[in-house]
Amino acid sequence: DNKGYCAQYRGEVCNAVLAKDALVFLNTSYADPEEAQELLVHTAWNELKVVSPVCRPAAEALLCNHIFQECSPGVVPTPIPICREYCLAVKELFCAKEWLVMEEKTHRGLYRSEMHLLSVPECSKLPSMHWDPTACARL
């Protein structure tokens, strides 16, 4: 699951969100990691066009940093997940109304593909910035 390599982000969708020259984790479980991850972001990004101005920038940051995780280079390149705190804040503060709608649609099977689910992290499974500040990315 966590097999991949570090590379500079060269896509377009997350250009404004990710730090310039950021090293991101590209997952080799995809045949073409760059293209596959960019497509994931692009698909989810289009859905964000209709969300509130409070939600949108927070959701974009969450999305980009979840799909293109910060990469810690080394003998074994490691993705650094988003901190649970930021994920929760996006889900239940910045985007509370939108998140409810999305969960409702998911339960009712209104999404045509499961792609959007891959782009939404499960907050409870993410590390906390209070337990080990180096284990996750603070946005």
Epitope: A58, R84, E85, Y86, C87, L88, A89, E92, L93, F94, C123, S124, K125, L126, H130, W131, R138
Partner: antibody, heavy 118, light 107 residues
Amino acid sequence: QVQLQESGPGLVKPSQTLSLTCTVSGGSISSGGHYWNWIRQHPGKGLEWIGYIYYSGTTYYNPSLKSRVTISVDTSKNQFSLKLSSVTAADTAVYYCAREVGIAFDYWGQGTLVTVSS
Amino acid sequence: DIQLTQSPSFLSASVGDRVTITCRASQGVSSYLAWYQQKPGKAPKLLIFAASALQSGVPSRFSGSGSGTEFTLTISSLQPEDFATYHCQQLNSYPPTFGQGTKVEIK
């Protein structure tokens, strides 16, 4: 809508242990990755964070109270509890339970006044 | 621990006034700062999170700004129901800490 409700004795004798329980309704303590907190407010003063518990049992306490505080969780009852030992008059306060949603406390109990007096 | 200092501690104002409360942190807290409103005998209520984001259901006359060590809460036109105590709080690093509170009273 998540609701929190504190319960426990309103009067505790000095040197004894203060025990409070917070019951959560409208949501599960075990889901979502939230921290469940205790906060207190001395009469006419500001707010003081006591500590939190995660559904797994992981705790984090305010260093200033750490030696006297124990927070526990009972997921089957959807409750978490506070025990504060060796209390003095300085522990007289309104005690609140609250849910932390990453970067803020979004849901609070109504608070319960605990008086330490013989 | 990070100390938060609110100013002023007390503020007398009239309905319709523009009110500004400042919160200064002893060290940088990024944008991990929240504001709460508390009425007598009630629990605090979340108004602003992440320094400037308005909590759902909070009137737009409330706004927050700042980052790092200096933050402000502004009420653009004070309403009768806004007379209360306001607290700032940081969650950038543990333990979470609160300001001492600012009581907004009727002039």
